[in-house]
């Protein structure tokens, strides 16, 4: 049957009429005009910018747009008092300093209000120190330091170049160390791809260019002060002391002109190996401190920014359902950009503008989608995924009684390769179908589907034919959704070719020179990537809103299963003796998701044959269906990371970006051969494995006949 | 009495794959309650688990040998196979087969082992 059977409208409203509707011009024209200053998170700029998404809605026809706003902690530089970073002779005096702005882009030059680059809740302070060199402060990366090299960087200022993992995760890593200052840089052996000019004549980073970007370690805590609660009008703040996730040492952020300054000079012990060495001329020393001729010079932090409580604002737009108006369907995306926010988030936020007119377009033509849509447009993403985790604070109760699904909508384009997709395994099935009937936008795939250029490019590791589809981790707006609420989520974007560029993220992430023209000039200038995405991301939508069947696939969370367990125990066993030692068991777990496997399977049968004429059958199959992953939700969360609650997923502990299957049983394997007490270590894993094997068979039998 | 035998070359050189055969007798391989895996004991270090494999061929690897790891098994001559390739004098150690309970580390019985030297 097809998706509009179930609102009795005339054959043209189908899924087709909707992607017809979505134009590539009306997406650059959308970017053009939210590019164009900067719209920072609690600024009047935002605000504005607010209010015209909320007219713009209006007059495409949603049923309502409301603003919902909260009273969150932000960060800012001081304006009189910037930030810098010096070298300093023995007398103390400023021998070199790093510079206090970018270079203003061709265009921009008269542009006011371009935040300076800083690293978002730095505290403020004047350290001064030596320098040691931590490579890109990874867990792994200190391991090798102290361990391997005995190596303290107790006292010390770290200098870490950015990429890998999550800026947050770097500082955390620094702080346990004992670091008083962290100094963060973007190597051009990440930020610079080879034969590629800097911008404004390449999409390569220059110089003076650098990486802004949030430090906090959230744990998808939301706004610092009110954890677990909407930051509203009566809110019961934390003092600062108690606030989560803030930094404990100032943190700042350099290019990498700059950063050749800071590295040239480092002496004391070699790079480990030719993976602590990037693309600059400097020798990569690990330190501590610098090199004979230099060895009395010091590095010292200047950081003055301030933390303060700032109203921010989300747009939410509602169209309603014609059948099932309490179910809901969301597509969300920031509004908030560090600069001009040319591809994070505009671009994605563009997407999103155009979608919301082609469904605008149709219910002017009197469709309506069966169940309800809402739009989103978050504001403070950047500074901690703020204004979606506090509507989901506040609408909580709605959201998980009647959450079916979440679509991310940040940055549209991180290359122009191929496809990415994160999400649920429930989705696998929607996105392989939906990508089969959407054209490849692909040089060299005219006239082939999305699917065929995807899977090309992107192969599956584990399926072949299939595409690569990845685990959901963090550092976007369906974090709240998804671990902590368990509603099923998923993003999709159009990447860079991982095999040959090797840089993280896009050179020009977080900095001055992402705008309109680099995405014009550069990445997308037909904007038929961008017109890819939005057909993937409405088509997504459109599907969850509108098919009478949920189109969720739980044979697929099964195969997902066995493959995480067979993989923690398979981590395990590096530990043979241990295991014995300890008795511990992966029994439970196997028969669990053995269980889960054979019920989805008898439930996916059962789908194929029930009267789908009959409401309320088709009601209760749903309800099964939209509650699957709800039921990988612990109640309790994980160990320490009460807001992260996915029993399956989570975003990883040494990586805020990536995610992790079986967190829990991975958290207590990890490092477990250096904890001081063993039989303690070995217990929480089991009692980690046993949470595990109870939660997926109690998911396993939410699919079973109720009766 | 269950009983297993390793067998394969004891010299490999670099950059080659090691091969051995474990032979079980005394019992069949085709039971779903046991594993059959490799373990290696370096000189002068610890057992370190390679693989296992139950008898439909489903295969349980260890993370940082993975890429070079292949486990099979033939049900019909009661034996299992370990190939490690891209061999460096690191995987120099002697080799076991044993059998150990599903989805835990009880190894139970365990060949006697052999010697796989790498070097040129």
């Known amino acids: 049957k097809s998706s509009n059977e179930a609102t009795n409208i005339t054959p043209k409203h189908n899924m087709k009429a909707f992607l017809d509707e979505l134009k590539a011009e009306n997406i650059k024209k959308f970017l053009y005009n939210f590019t164009q200053i900067p719209h920072l998170a609690g600024t009047e700029q935002n605000f504005q910018l607010a209010k015209q998404i909320q007219s713009q809605w209006k007059e495409f026809g949603l049923d309502s747009v409301e603003l919902a706003h909260y009273d969150v902690l932000l960060s800012y530089p001081n304006k009189t008092h910037p930030n810098y970073i010096s070298i300093i002779n023995e007398d103390g005096n400023e021998i070199f300093n790093t510079s206090l702005f970018e270079p203003p882009p061709p265009g921009y030059e008269n542009v006011s209000d371009i935040v300076p680059p800083f690293s978002a809740f730095s505290p403020q302070g004047m350290p001064e120190g030596d320098l040691v060199y931590v490579n890109y402060a990874r867990t792994e990366d200190f391991f090798k330091l102290e361990r391997d090299m005995k190596i303290n960087c107790s006292g010390k200022i770290v200098i870490a170049r950015y990429g890998k993992v999550f800026r947050g995760n770097k500082v955390k890593n620094a702080q346990l160390a004992g670091a008083k200052g962290v100094i963060l840089y973007s190597d051009p052996a990440d930020y610079f791809a080879p034969g590629v000019k800097s911008y404004p004549d390449g999409w390569n980073l220059p110089g003076g260019g650098v990486q802004r970007g949030n430090i906090l370690n959230l744990n998808g805590a939301g706004d610092p002060l009110t954890p677990g609660y909407p930051a509203n009008e009566y809110a019961y703040r934390r003092g600062i002391a108690e606030a989560v996730g803030l930094p404990s040492i100032p943190v700042h952020p350099i290019g990498y002109y700059d950063a050749q300054k800071l590295l040239e000079k480092m002496g004391g012990s070699a790079p480990p190996d030719s993976s602590w060495r990037g693309s600059l001329k400097v020798p990569y020393n690990v330190g501590p401190g610098f090199t004979g001729n230099f060895s009395t010079q010091k590095v010292k932090m200047h950081i003055h920014s301030t933390n303060e409580v700032t109203r921010i604002y989300n747009v939410i737009g509602t169209l309603r359902g014609a059948v099932e108006p309490d179910r809901y369907v969301i597509l969300g995306g920031h509004r908030d950009s560090w600069v001009f926010g040319g591809i994070d988030p505009q671009s994605g936020a563009a997407v999103v503008h155009e979608i919301v007119r082609s469904f605008g377009t149709l219910k002017k033509e009197g469709w309506r989608p069966r169940r309800t849509i809402l739009f989103a447009s978050w504001d403070a993403e950047e500074f901690g995924l703020l204004g979606s985790t506090e509507w989901a604070e506040e609408n909580s109760r709605l959201l998980q009684e009647r959450g079916v699904a979440y679509i991310n909508a940040d940055s549209s384009i991180e290359g122009n390769y191929t496809l990415r997709v994160d999400c649920t395994p429930l989705m696998y099935s929607l996105v392989h179908n939906l990508t089969k009937e959407l054209k490849s936008p692909d040089e060299g795939f005219e006239g082939k589907s999305l699917y065929e250029s995807w899977t090309k490019k992107s192969p599956s590791p584990e399926f072949s034919g299939m595409p690569r589809i990845s685990k959901l981790g963090s550092g976007n707006d369906f974090e709240v959704f998804f671990q902590r609420l368990g509603i099923a989520s998923g993003r999709a974007r159009y990447t860079k070719n991982w095999e040959t560029n090797k840089f993280s993220g896009y050179p020009l992430y977080h900095s001055v020179y992402e705008t309109y023209e680099l995405v014009e000039k550069f990445y997308d200038p037909m904007f038929k990537y961008h017109l890819t995405v939005a057909q993937v991301r409405g088509g997504m939508v459109f599907e969850l809103a509108n098919s009478i069947v949920l189109p969720f696939d739980c044979r697929d969370y099964a195969v997902v299963l066995r493959k995480y367990a067979d993989k923690i125990y398979s981590i395990s066993m590096k530990h043979p003796q241990e295991m014995k030692t300890y008795s511990v068991s992966f029994d439970s777990l196997f028969s669990a998701v053995k269980n889960f496997t054979e019920i989805a399977s008898k439930f996916s049968e059962r789908l194929q044959d029930f009267d789908k004429s009959n409401p309320i059958v088709l009601r209760m199959m749903n309800d099964q269906l939209m509650f699957l992953e709800r039921a990988f939700i612990d109640p309790l969360g994980l160990p320490d990371r009460p807001f992260y609650r996915h029993v399956i997923y989570a975003p990883s502990s040494h990586n805020k970006y990536a995610g992790e299957s079986f967190p829990g049983i991975y958290d207590a394997l990890f490092d477990i051969e250096s904890k001081v007490d063993p039989s303690k270590a070995w217990g929480e894993v089991k009692r980690q494995i046993y949470v595990a094997a109870f939660t997926v068979q109690a998911a396993a039998e939410t699919l079973s006949e109720v009766a | 009495q269950l009983q297993l035998q390793e067998s394969g070359p004891g010299l490999v050189k670099p950059s080659e794959t090691l091969s051995l055969t474990c032979t079980v007798s005394?019992?069949?391989?085709?039971?779903?309650?046991y594993y059959w895996g490799w373990i290696r004991q370096p000189p002068g270090k610890g057992l370190e688990w390679i693989?296992?494999?139950?008898?439909?061929?489903?295969?349980y690897y260890n993370p940082s040998l993975q890429s070079r790891v292949t486990i099979s098994v033939d049900t019909s001559k009661n034996q299992f196979s370990l190939k490690l390739s891209s061999v460096t004098a690191a995987d120099t150690a002697v080799y076991n087969c044993a059998r150990h309970k599903a989805a835990t580390a009880d190894f139970d019985y365990r060949g006697q082992g052999t010697l796989v030297t790498v070097s040129s």
């Open positions: 693989g296992s494999i139950d008898y439909s061929g489903y295969t």
């Open positions: 005394g019992g069949s391989i085709s039971s779903s309650s």
